[in-house]
Amino acid sequence: KAMHVAQPAVVLASSRGIASFVCEYASPGKATEVRVTVLRQADSQVTEVCAATYMMGNELTFLDDSICTGTSSGNQVNLTIQGLRAMDTGLYICKVELMYPPPYYLGIGNGTQIYVIDPEPCPDSD
C-alpha cells in the first residue's frame, strides 16, 4: 500500500560537509517497526546511501558502513548525512516502509536536492 512521504526540496550542506533534513510520513496506522532508506539519484545511478530500522520510540539503528545518523519523533525522522563533498551533490530520496504490524506500507519522497560546496583552503600565512 502507498503512503505519502514529505521532505524538503533543497538543503545546503554545512562547510563541514554535513547535511540534515526531516523526512515525514503520513502513517495510516500504528506502526511499531519502521525502515527508512536514503537513496541518492545522480551520476546515472541510484544508490542506497544508508538504511535504518527502528521500533517506534527507540533510536535509529543504521546498517553497515553508515555515513548517516538520525532520530525519530512520531512520524518524523531527522536525518543527518556526514562527510559530504562537492562531488556528493545530488538528489537524496527518503524511502519509508512500515514493516510491522501488517499491512505493509511503502512511501517514497520526491527527494531533497543536497548541494555541497567544498570549503576554500585557508591561504598560507607567512
Partner: nanobody
Framework: EVQLVESGGGLVQTGGSLRLSCAAS????????MGWFRQAPGKDREFVAA????????SYADSVNGRFTISRDNAKKMAYLQMNSLKPEDTASYYC??????????????????WGQGTQVTVSS
Amino acid sequence: EVQLVESGGGLVQTGGSLRLSCAASGRTFSNYTMGWFRQAPGKDREFVAAISRSGSLKSYADSVNGRFTISRDNAKKMAYLQMNSLKPEDTASYYCAAAPVPWGTRPSFLTYDSWGQGTQVTVSS
C-alpha cells in the same frame, strides 16, 4: 588484495536471464565492498552494480536498475549478479571487483584494487 574469479556468462536470447558468480579467495572477504563492471567492445568500462560489506546497501546503474540484482554471501566468499530481462545492449565482458574501503554516496567511484579476469555475456536478438 583478494583474488577474484567470475563464472556464469554465456549466450542468451533477448528477455532471458543469467546469474554471474564471483568467487573470492585470499583476504577477509567481508572487509570489501564488491562491484560489478562491464565493458563492451570499443567502449569504456562502465559501472553496473555494487554492494556494501555486509550486503545491506546496494547501488545500480540506471541502465540496469530493476532488471539486475546484486547480492553476496560472506560465509561462502561469493558475490552474485542476477541479470533478468536481458537486452542486446547488455552484451559485454562482465568483471567482478573488490574495494577495501567502506560504503559511501558514490560506490562506483571507490578504489577497486582487485579485479577478476571477466566473463563474457552475449545477448542475441
